[in-house]
Interface confidence: low
């Protein structure tokens, strides 16, 4: 003869794949203190238990090592711990208490466990700013993972130079020493739960601060096509009276501050233009000589110079001789 008792709490519980859940169970208060027996958790419809404290009883292979009976008759505890939840754990379960010396056992009401797709994703935290050439520790964490589950496997993917730091059950540290070319590239942390065969990932775009590496001048002369200067140039022939537009361009993150100077400027020199554009509407003797574009950045500056050589128009000189 079986005696029934009601499981306390909800009739169903939800757990995400790969995570853990505790199915609460309290032994009936009517249970005699002298009652000695074994506890068994069953999946509805199956006669092999999923968990038990009976050393002579085999449990289902599917649940072995993942389902545990938390047995403490003094505290009336008969809860079921499920770790590394799998989709196929989606079922109804009940608890049975039986004794070899008693005529009757106790059987609980049923409780449904719903296993849902894993929606949590890893968090990637970056302390402060990523600076080119400086190591930074990035942490990929899964704070929603339970300690008693099979430790997840952390995988990092990045084009930047990296090395693995310490890890815990819930986090992994990656030391990254980014280069300028790593700015805006992807870094992925992937977390695999081997117990459930589930993988989640998060991808971030690296924001790498770096000083300008390249500075260039594009020259627009009248209506003719622009051309670009990538290194200091000794002289650029320009026709007197011609309009000239000099466009300075530099990389760097955050963007470098561009300014134009006449001549080779001292550090505290006053710029003739506070942008990357220098307009020379009519080139004359005042414009002959050097023009320098400086790309200023908190992490370092770079400059490029251009020397203008004015070709005088013959008629422009006739009256002055």
């Amino acid at each position: 003869q079986e005696r029934r008792f009601q499981l306390e709490g909800p009739e169903s519980l939800t757990v995400q794949e790969g995570l853990c859940v505790l199915v609460p169970c309290r032994l009936p208060t009517t249970l005699p203190a002298s009652y000695y027996g074994y506890g068994y958790w069953f999946l509805e419809g199956a006669d092999v238990p999923v968990a038990t404290n009976d050393p002579d009883e085999e449990v289902q292979e599917e649940t072995r090592g993942r389902f545990h009976l938390l047995w403490d008759p003094r505290r009336k505890n008969c809860s079921l711990s499920i770790r590394d939840a799998r989709r196929r754990d989606n079922a109804a379960y009940f608890f049975r208490l039986k004794s070899k010396w008693m005529k009757y056992g106790y059987t609980s009401s049923k409780l449904s466990v719903r296993v849902m797709a894993l929606t949590h994703r890893p968090n990637i935290s970056i302390p402060g700013t990523l600076e080119s050439g400086h190591p930074s520790n990035l942490t990929c964490s899964v704070p929603w993972v339970c300690e008693q589950g099979t430790p997840p496997i952390f995988s990092w993917m990045s084009a930047a130079p990296t090395s693995l730091g310490p890890r815990t059950t819930q986090s992994s540290v990656l030391t990254i020493t980014p280069r300028p070319q790593d700015h805006s590239t992807n870094l992925t942390c992937q977390v695999t739960f081997p117990g459930a065969g589930v993988t989640m990932e998060r991808t971030i775009q690296l924001n790498v601060s770096y000083a300008p590496q390249k500075v260039a001048i594009s020259i627009f002369q009248g209506n003719s096509a622009a051309f670009k200067i990538l290194q200091n140039t000794s002289s650029l022939p320009v026709l007197e009276g011609q309009a000239l537009r000099l466009l300075c361009d530099a990389d760097g993150n955050p963007p470098a501050h561009l300014s134009w100077f006449q001549g080779f400027p001292a550090l505290n020199a006053t710029p003739i233009s506070n942008t990357g554009v220098l307009e020379l509407p009519q080139v004359g003797s005042a414009e002959e000589g050097d023009f320098t574009c400086r790309a200023q950045h908190p992490l370092g500056s770079l400059q490029i110079s251009l020397s203008l050589f004015v070709h005088w128009k013959p008629e422009g000189r006739a009256g002055g001789v």
Epitope: R86, R88, I153, M157, L164, G197, T199, E201, T203
Partner: antibody, heavy 121, light 106 residues
């Protein structure tokens, strides 16, 4: 060029063991699982298990767990599979493969050259 | 574990013909991968995540389906397509493969 290089063939006696190797090149070895797949002559493909090169954590196909032991040597970017107590049923081509990680899908994007294991006395 | 059944086992087609092969899962899966294998060679990824062609796969190949079944279609078969095609799932652990469809060109 991403490659998984495996020895061409192994001839072993029944009851013996064999250790197959899979050398990776052309990518960051520690960023990808190595999987092993079995193909018996004229038959389909069967997943044996996987190993992650950073932790060495393994996950096996329960059906073949007794037969295979997966290990890894990070320093040489090589994965190994030891097959024990070999019988004629284990005569097959064994492939190692790399898994591509998509946001919502997995597939084997790189396969090894395959090692033909022949169990014969 | 999920069982994948492929049909037909052998498919014979003439160049230029349209062919479709099917992969049926014993329970619903969220996506399907396909691999091509030629005799004496390793399998090659062919279609991943149901409908995405792997690198270098001609546009005459396409994949479709959801839940179950899934299919691989070749709009106009060419001689170089002669091979065995395997479907594979990993919606449920462990990953499983179909038994293969062998495509023969007449």
């Amino acid at each position: 060029q991403v490659q998984l290089q495996q020895p061409g063939a192994e001839l072993v006696k029944p009851g013996a063991s064999v250790k197959l190797s899979c050398k990776a090149s052309g990518y960051t070895f520690t960023n990808y699982y190595i999987h092993w797949v079995k193909q018996r002559p004229g038959q389909g493909l069967e997943w044996i298990g996987m190993i992650h090169p950073i932790s060495g954590s393994t996950n096996y196909n329960e059906k073949l767990k007794i037969k295979a032991t997966l290990t890894v040597d990070k320093s040489s970017s090589t994965a190994y599979m030891q097959l024990s107590s070999l019988t004629s049923e284990d005569s097959a081509v064994y492939y190692c493969a790399r898994r591509y990680y998509g946001s919502s899908y997995w597939y084997f994007d790189v396969w090894g050259t395959g090692t033909t294991v022949t169990v014969s006395s | 574990q999920i069982v994948l059944s492929q049909s037909p086992a052998i498919l014979s087609a003439s160049p230029g013909e349209k062919v479709t092969m099917t992969c049926r899962a014993s329970s619903s899966v969220s996506y399907m991968n396909w691999y091509q294998q030629k005799p004496g060679s390793s399998p090659k990824p062919w279609i991943y995540a149901t409908s995405n062609l792997a690198s270098g796969v001609p546009a005459r190949f396409s994949g479709s389906g959801s839940g179950t079944p899934y299919s691989l279609t070749i709009s106009r078969v060419e001689a170089e397509d002669a091979a065995t095609y395997y479907c594979q799932q990993w919606s449920s652990h462990p990953p499983t493969f179909g038994s293969g469809t062998k495509l023969e060109i007449k």
